[in-house]
Each structure stands twice: as structure tokens, then as C-alpha cells.
Amino acid sequence: LRPSRVHNSEENTMRALTLKDILNGTFSYKTFFPNWISGQEYLHQSADNNIVLYNIETGQSYTILSNRTMKSVNASNYGLSPDRQFVYLESDYSKLWRYSYTATYYIYDLSNGEFVRGNELPRPIQYLCWSPVGSKLAYVYQNNIYLKQRPGDPPFQITFNGRENKIFNGIPDWVYEEEMLPTKYALWWSPNGKFLAYAEFNDKDIPVIAYSYYGDEQYPRTINIPYPKAGAKNPVVRIFIIDTTYPAYVGPQEVPVPAMIASSDYYFSWLTWVTDERVCLQWLKRVQNVSVLSICDFREDWQTWDCPKTQEHIEESRTGWAGGFFVSRPVFSYDAISYYKIFSDKDGYKHIHYIKDTVENAIQITSGKWEAINIFRVTQDSLFYSSNEFEEYPGRRNIYRISIGSYPPSKKCVTCHLRKERCQYYTASFSDYAKYYALVCYGPGIPISTLHDGRTDQEIKILEENKELENALKNIQLPKEEIKKLEVDEITLWYKMILPPQFDRSKKYPLLIQVYGGPCSQSVRSVFAVNWISYLASKEGMVIALVDGRGTAFQGDKLLYAVYRKLGVYEVEDQITAVRKFIEMGFIDEKRIAIWGWSYGGYVSSLALASGTGLFKCGIAVAPVSSWEYYASVYTERFMGLPTKDDNLEHYKNSTVMARAEYFRNVDYLLIHGTADDNVHFQNSAQIAKALVNAQVDFQAMWYSDQNHGLSGLSTNHLYTHMTHFLKQCFSLSD
């Protein structure tokens, strides 16, 4: 549902988007994800901040926790115990890295309407969660794991070796949080809460990245993070499982690592409980083209976990790395031994396979020149998944149901024809046993969330339709968007073009390329957005284009793995190729072409500007990587191998931005970075700047003091205002 285009006669009542609209978030949308607590019930925080329980079948709802109780401890989040006796209330949220944060937790007893007193939780807590059954609590405090039988009970300390920046129990270190799990937690309850599995990360030998945090004290403080850059020493991971009913009896039992993995550096990639006494662990060699899925069983007699070789399943890539961005996770079926998993088929497309005994004997469930993206739920008779099959648009997501109870399995697209113009990009959230599910549509029209019957797929009700947003956009001249493809040398380059509202093909427009381009990413998606580039098209009359070139996802392994061991080459070439094709379309002013990107996109935009093609007048790099030797081991080595002479050092050296310093002479370059970037370190931009200065090349730069990779808060406003001025100046647009 794009607000309908209005006839010219009414166009004088319409206004263009302003930068202020974007910075104020005037046209942001809402989604509705039910917090499922059973097959037919969910919790949701109402507009007035009451926590309300909805029963779909009775149609009734009631407040389980009042906003007054929430406000009494300044709670910003909550969690209901599975036995519905207690709620944890989270306050004093303090962000750490991408997912991690610390908080203060209060436990509210619903039976007596009081906060639990006695044996209160320590503060601040790094992670806390209920057991899947009852009201046991597991939490991480000062890098150690504790257990509480019930909220008012004394805690049982499970680990004792936790130490800041050295040993992490139940929570990941920086690199596992960002690049491997990627979660704020590293502990997992078994389905009925009998066992608790957890990871221990030993970072003692990892080199530390140190940077100044200026704050407002007389002396800046130094932030130290164990951060393995490419080729450096990595964290050492161990997985333990403890019996939570009698944890002191035998203590934590280590789960053995498969021999073929343990023979050299390795990673743990995920843990999936199958039953209370069966667990599945996934491991990955440091050279990330071999993954092993290991199914382990509890041996009651020895109180240990046994992982027989016969239950090891190997996934190997001969053309790239294992998996997509991450190695996919298994979804087990009801027999508790067979599972469904997405991996590449023989034609090089990621598809759902059913593994009963060995990977070699896997039964392929989906197939075609498209990709299965996520398995949402497997029930006794159905498998729900998302893919980009429909109408052959890789940037779409529809939800499908495969009946696995019947043979041959029949496939139904649940979402393809629901709101076809408005909705082409869905995700879903399922209740227990998939009795009901919520569909969240992200676009291309205004997002809408709906509730559906899991048996019939019938829509029950609209959960959120963003009516206010729809009304607010009625008098806004939004840009036009089109998604098309270019066929170049047997490569398909999908692109999204954002065109000014009164676009006229006979006129010439400045072109801005927005690029990300990282391995297994996708920028060309059928989603709704009113953002900075919408404003640039609507108000400033620019054409903006996003192009998915080689290395991007969901179009098969040939495109995805093309960049393997060669980052910084084809991604850049494909942006340049697309620009040339856009020029051929006739409406681009070839003297006014710019490129910008953030993070990996900053790397690509920098390399494109320094490509020596003369195509780009100017460009912006925000928080760019400048050398792969500066970035995290887990991410970098996945795509580049190791920076050693006998592996891929040569390309590490050839692919730096600094090596191309000379080529920036004929472009206007704006380099931007936060000084407290824990992810892509300020070091990256510092080295670019040094190389440009040494080459006597003029450039513009902006740093954001004490800001991380997200450049949030007031910095966001400053950033986009600054970039707008830069582009307007570059394109000779009046202020």
C-alpha cells in the first residue's frame, strides 16, 4: 500500500520530504510480533505500557502487569516465567556491543502482587532467562553463571573462573557475539529445564584493541577489548552441560569436540537441544569451509555426554565457505534424530534438505534456481519456510507451507497472493505447535502485521496496519521505486532505483549509488522505507541506485562465492558496471555521479572512488574497513583465508584502500568514523587519512568523538546533515 499517486491538479497540496522528517523519524513504521506464551496466547505491551495477555480462542484479554508496576522500577522490558507465577522486570539498560547489555532485574510475584524480597539478584546482570518450564532462573553476573531454583531462593554458582576480558561463561566474547552466534547469550536450557548447556570462552591469549574514550573527565579512559584480527590468536571455546536439578552432584560436564575439528583451530557455531537428553552442537574449522554437526546423548550411567562418530554430519564447501553468512541451524523433527537443514544443493542453490542418517543420503525438499532462506517451524505434518521463489525476484520473501505428512509433499505459498501489491517481503512468528502465527509484511507498501490460523491459514485479525503513517504520507511526494535487473556477461545484477516524484526520462539527474556489497548481503529488497535516500530523491531531485553484485546473497553460490578469497574486486567492478549501464539509460548526468556506503559499503565506495575510472565525482565512506588485516578474524577469514605467505597474504595487501591513495586525487572524498568504534576500528580511517596525507591528496573528514559503529543519537543528525551538504555541493545543488 503505497499512498496512491495524486493527479497533477492536486500536486500543489503535496510536499516533498525534508531532511527534518527523516531525522525526526516522522515516517517510521510499527510492526507487531506477539510474545507467544502458548499455542493460543500471547503477551503484548499496550500503548499505555500495560502488559496484556491475549487469548485468541476466547477472544479475551487481561492485564497481567500494570504500567504502574512497570513504572515503579522504571522497567523497559519484561519476561513472564513459563509457570506464569513470576515476571522479571528489566531496568537500567546499559548497552555494551551489538546485542549485549547489562541491566538490573526485579522479580515480581504475580500470585501475591509483590516484588520478591530476599536473595535479590545482584546488579548489573549481563544475561538472565527463565527455564522453559517452571520458574528456574539462569543468569550471568561478572562473567559467571548462577542458577536459582525459584526467584526467592539463594543462588547456586555454577562457574567460578569468570574474569573480565579473560574468561566468559554463558555470554560470548566480542567476536563470538558479533560474528558467530550472533547473540548476547551463550547458554541454552534443555526443553524441560533439566539441563543447562553453556559456552566458556577463554580470551587470555587474544590481542587487545585499545582506544580512548574521551567522556568529560580530565583524562580519557582506555577501552580494552580482546579482539582477534585476521590471523591473530582466537578465543578457545569449550561447551559444558550441567544437570540443574542436582548441579553439585557431578558438576559441569564438558561436551567432546569432534576429532576432525579438534585437530586444529576451530569455532563452536551453535547449540540446539533436541530432547532433554539429546543435544546437537555445530562446530567449524578455523578455515571455515568445513562444518561438523554432532549429535550427543546423555549417558545416565556415567553422567556424561557421548557424541558418537556415527552421529557426526559433515558439511563442506569446495567453492567457498560453509553456509551463507552463517552455517544454517538444524530444525529437528519429532523423531528427535532426523532434521531439516538449509545447505547448497548440487546446482549451487541453498535449499531445504531432510537428513535422516547421513548428509550424503539427504533428501532434498525444495529445489529450483532460487533459495530457501529460513525454516520457521516443523510440526507433525507441516514445514513452514521462507524463500524468494515467487515470480523470480530474489529481493522478495514469501512464506510457504510444505505438507510433510503426505507423499509426495505438497507446497503452498501462504503469502504470495495476500496483499500482492502491498506485501512482497514477509517474516513470520509461530505459536506453540504452529497453532497460530503472525505475518509481518515489510513492504514494498506500508508494513502490516496480521494474525493467522495455523491450520487453515485464514487471517484472523490485523495486529498493526500503520494507519497513522498512511495518513501522514497522504500529502507527501514520495519518490518512485523500481526493482529491475541488468544482464552483464552472464551475471545478473539486480538493482533498485529510487526516482524523484516528477521523474522525467528526458531529463538528466544526478546519481547517487548507495552500496553495502558485503558477502552474503542483499540491498535490493522489496521493503518499505522512508529514509535519507528517499529525501534525496523527493526533495533534492537525485536518482539513487542500489545494486546487488557478486558476493551478494540468495541468488546461488556462483554469485555468492565469486568473491571468495578476493574481497574488494568484483563487488567494486559490479558497481562500476551498473553505473555505466545507468548512464546508457539516458537520464543520468554523467558529470554528477556519487557513491556512498557504510562499513563494508564504505570500503567498497572508497575502492570505487579510487578505481581510476573517472566515473565518480565524489563519494562518502562512513566507518569503512580499509585493510582486511584490521578486521575481525571470524568474519574476515571466512571470506579471505589467512593473512600468511602460504595462504592469502598477497590479496590482503592488494585489497587495501591505502594502496590506492594516489587515485583519490581526482575525486572529492568525505571520510567519516566514530572514534569509539568497537567493530570497525577508527584505526581503519586513521590509516586511510595517513596514506592520503602522505600522498598529498586533499580530502574531507569528520570524526565523531566517543561514537561507535552506529553513529547514533545526536551524531546521526549531524552525520546526515553533513553528508547532505557534501552531496549538494558536489552536485551543485542550491541550499
Epitope: G134, S135, K136, L147, Q149, R150, D153, P154, F156, Q157, F160, K194, D243, T244, T245, Y246, P247, A248, Y249, V250, G251
Partner: antibody, heavy 118, light 108 residues
């Protein structure tokens, strides 16, 4: 208030059997592991047996293994100890206790005296 | 199994004095998994300390526990008349759980 009340003790001949019960109240019985601990007259404490909250896992001291059986009925909030092939050295006050994590015991019942003698 | 030896066997002190009770393990008690109990004549034991140093709910702060490895201590900073009893240590770091033989704290 948490209360644990043992019953079923008494005088029994060597080789005989006895079944002890422990009635629990004042807490969510099904959420906790439970144990039996004994104390011979004028002597120290000895852990005898433990059981997980659901009853799925049971644990025994070597001195009673194969002779004693611990069980529980969560619907009745009751813990049991079936004692067979009793010996003179089993003479003691038997306490039932809420067992935290297979670790410490808190609180304890008042105990019931079992005397094995001919 | 881990054998716990408590010393002294009997400790004679006056109210207001400081009491130091020792518990030594035959091998290291993992993770300081040690508890202390108080038992008065004709009564069941009562938990004082768990985790070597954490006071149980409702236990006065004159009771404190310390130690790790093989040597543990229960300290009563100022003895009150009601503190005279038998004190037991118990380890739960290794199976089976075992108790010390007890220290009798009596009024001098």
C-alpha cells in the same frame, strides 16, 4: 512458612522393612530436589539419598544403595524412603530436607527415629 | 570420598567473645562448595552458610564463612548465648556429600 514433617519411624528387626514419609507444606514442593539425611545417636550427620524435583533422578549413598528407595508424590507433596534389609547400623534419626541444587540442605524436618534391633 | 575434619572438637568460650571454627578437607573442595550448620540438642540442623561464605536467609551477620581449597573457617564475631551448639561443615563439591564430625561450642 516451610514445614517438613517426617513419619513412619519405629522399631524394626534386622532384615526388616520400613517406609518413611515426609509431608511438605509452605513451598512449591514440585520445584525442589529433596533428600534424606540421618544421624546415628550421639554421632554426626550422613547424607542418605536424594531425588530430583520431578522424581526422574535418584541418588544414594553407597551404604544404602540397593536397599533403600527414594520416591516422591508431587500431587501429595510427600517424599518417601522405602528401607529394606535394615541393619543395626541404620539406627538413626532420619531427617528429610529441602535439597538445594544437590548441594546444601535447608530447611530440615524434625526427624523420625528408626531403631533396628532384635 | 572427601573427609572433613573439624577442629577443635570442643571450643569453650564466653558470650561476647569471638569464635573461630575450622574445617579441613582431605582434598580440595571444588568451587568452595561448602556449607555450615548449627544444631542444638533435640533439634534439626539449621543452615548458616553456603558457598563457603554466603549467609543463609535470616542468619545474623555475626556469622561469617571464609576459605577455599582445603581450609575453611566459620567465624562468630561476638558470641550470643543462643550460639552455643554443635556446628557441622558439609562439602558438596564432590559425590557423595559429606559432613565433618562437628565442633561443640560450649559456654566457658
Amino acid at each position: 512458612e516451610v514445614q517438613l514433617l517426617e513419619s513412619g519411624g519405629g522399631l524394626v528387626q534386622p532384615g526388616g522393612s520400613l517406609r518413611l514419609s515426609c509431608a511438605a507444606s509452605g513451598f512449591t514442593f514440585s520445584s525442589y530436589a529433596m533428600s534424606w539425611v540421618r544421624q546415628a545417636p550421639g554421632k554426626g550427620l550422613e547424607w542418605v539419598s536424594g531425588i530430583s524435583e520431578g522424581g526422574g533422578s535418584t541418588y544414594y549413598a553407597d551404604s544404602v544403595k540397593g536397599r533403600f528407595t527414594i520416591s516422591r508424590d508431587n500431587s501429595k507433596n510427600t517424599l518417601y524412603l522405602q528401607m529394606n534389609s535394615l541393619r543395626a547400623e541404620d539406627t538413626a534419626v532420619y531427617y528429610c530436607a529441602k535439597d538445594y541444587y544437590g548441594g546444601w540442605f535447608d530447611p530440615w524436618g524434625r526427624g523420625t527415629l528408626v531403631t533396628v534391633s532384635s | 570420598e572427601i573427609v572433613l575434619t573439624q577442629s577443635p572438637g570442643t571450643l569453650s568460650l564466653s558470650p561476647g567473645e569471638r569464635a573461630t571454627l575450622s574445617c579441613r578437607a582431605s582434598q580440595s573442595v571444588s568451587s568452595s562448595y561448602l556449607a555450615w550448620y548449627q544444631q542444638k540438642p533435640g533439634q534439626a540442623p539449621r543452615l548458616l552458610i553456603y558457598g563457603a561464605s554466603s549467609r543463609a536467609t535470616g542468619i545474623p551477620d555475626r556469622f561469617s564463612g571464609s576459605g577455599s581449597g582445603t581450609d575453611f573457617t566459620l567465624t562468630i564475631s561476638r558470641l550470643e548465648p543462643e550460639d552455643f551448639a554443635v556446628y557441622y561443615c558439609q562439602q558438596y563439591g564432590s559425590s557423595p556429600r559429606t559432613f565433618g564430625q562437628g565442633t561443640r561450642l560450649e559456654i566457658k
